[in-house]
Interface confidence: low
């Protein structure tokens, strides 16, 4: 293909003063074949603390698509299939590494960023505070 | 920390032929202040599908430390505090992006890698296969 048009504001790959940079090969070694969480398991539906998956898209970030879990209920599903509010559905969060284009729109320059994402939900016993 | 010994075979940061590379600024923008999952919540203990967190360390990877969840039981904890084997504790997995030193020990050269990690556990209704 042709050369990527260069943003005049993009830092030079050869600039030794560009702060704390490394070269990263973008040919991703992917140990996992299935990247769509909706296909990888149906736990989000079968859990006692079920969740929905929301698509978060940002073209200036890699990965550009992140799936965020949102718990369906405040309580948990009991054996009868009803919501039991004596228990709580809570999101399990994971800190992940993403690449953020910096400056924006530069094809060859990124900054590492850590973001917190909700991966799924679990059912927990609530912390009850007794008032004297 | 000490300087990583340089592999004589490391590609040159200025090598324009180094395949499909970008510059990545390692000054991480971290939106989260708490990086230790054991401190961030006690859900792993309070969940009806509790889990233990195992430290996975690899100096050739960034992040070098990843916490892996392992469900404590096959079943889930019921209201009496006993394990109910009519339900299943299962790991919630997340695909994350890491940087792998390539070639090994190079201080300024990485390859993107995707790995699957278990973030926590959730309690699900088992799939029962009825034999005719």
């Amino acid at each position: 293909g042709i050369t990527i048009p260069r943003n005049p504001g993009c830092p030079n790959s050869e600039d030794k003063n560009f702060p704390r940079t490394v070269m990263v090969n973008l040919n991703i070694h992917n140990r996992n074949t299935n990247t769509n969480p909706k296909r990888s398991s149906d736990y989000y539906n079968r859990s006692t603390s079920p969740w929905n998956l929301h698509r978060n898209e940002d073209p200036e970030r890699y990965p550009s698509v992140i799936w965020e879990a949102k718990c369906r209920h405040l309580g948990c599903i009991n054996a009868d299939g009803n919501v039991d509010y004596h228990m709580n559905s809570v999101p399990i969060q994971q800190e992940i590494l993403v690449l953020r284009r910096e400056p924006p729109h530069c094809p060859n320059s990124f900054r590492l960023e850590k973001i917190l994402v909700s991966v799924g939900c679990t059912c927990v016993t609530p912390i009850v505070h007794h008032v004297a | 920390g000490i300087t990583i010994p340089r592999n004589p075979g490391c590609p040159n940061s200025e090598d324009k032929n180094f395949p499909r590379t970008v510059m990545v600024n390692l000054n991480i923008h971290n939106r989260n202040t708490n990086t230790n999952p054991k401190r961030s919540s006690d859900y792993y203990n309070r969940s009806t599908s509790p889990w233990n967190l195992h430290r996975n360390e690899d100096p050739e990877r960034y992040p070098s430390v990843i916490w892996e969840a392992k469900c404590r039981h096959l079943g889930c904890i019921n209201a009496d505090g006993n394990v109910d084997y009519h339900m299943n504790s299962v790991p919630i997995q997340q695909e994350i992006l890491v940087l792998r030193r390539e070639p090994p020990h190079c201080p300024n050269s990485f390859r993107l890698e995707k790995i699957l990690v278990s973030v926590g556990c959730t309690c699900v209704t088992p799939i029962v296969h009825h034999v005719a």
């Epitope: 293909g1 040919n27 094809p107 | -």
Partner: nanobody, 119 residues
């Protein structure tokens, strides 16, 4: 040999319309998300629109929302960009791109088609 060939650019007055086309060959077109990207004179690269491989979802940069429409015809291996209510700031070279490893880090680019919005 992957090829992306854009067409449909030209000179148009503010408020006018243009339809850009991109003919793809050399790869399984229906397996990839496709993008329109532009570069205004003396400016940086700007992502404009993205369409999923099956055409089920579209994404637009804020500045073109409601005015531009990305579409595709997998049978014809073609990508389109319908541009309405064009403004002077839409003047740029428009590139069709095939996304693969990194969105916005494209494996292959077309040669681009120049869109000039001027009275």
């Amino acid at each position: 040999q992957v090829q992306l060939v854009e067409s449909g650019g030209g000179l148009v007055q503010p408020g006018g319309s243009l339809r850009l086309s991109c003919a793809a060959s050399g790869f399984t077109f229906s397996s990839y998300g496709m993008y329109w990207v532009r570069q205004a004179p003396g400016k940086g690269l700007e992502w404009v629109a993205k369409i999923e491989q099956d055409g089920s979802e579209e994404y637009y940069v804020d500045s073109v929302k409601g005015r531009f429409t990305i579409s595709r015809d997998n049978a014809k291996k073609s990508l389109y960009l319908q541009m309405n209510s064009l403004r002077a700031e839409d003047t740029a070279v428009y590139y069709c791109a095939k996304g693969e490893i990194l969105p916005l880090y494209f494996d292959y680019w077309g040669q681009g088609t120049l869109v000039t919005v001027s009275s």
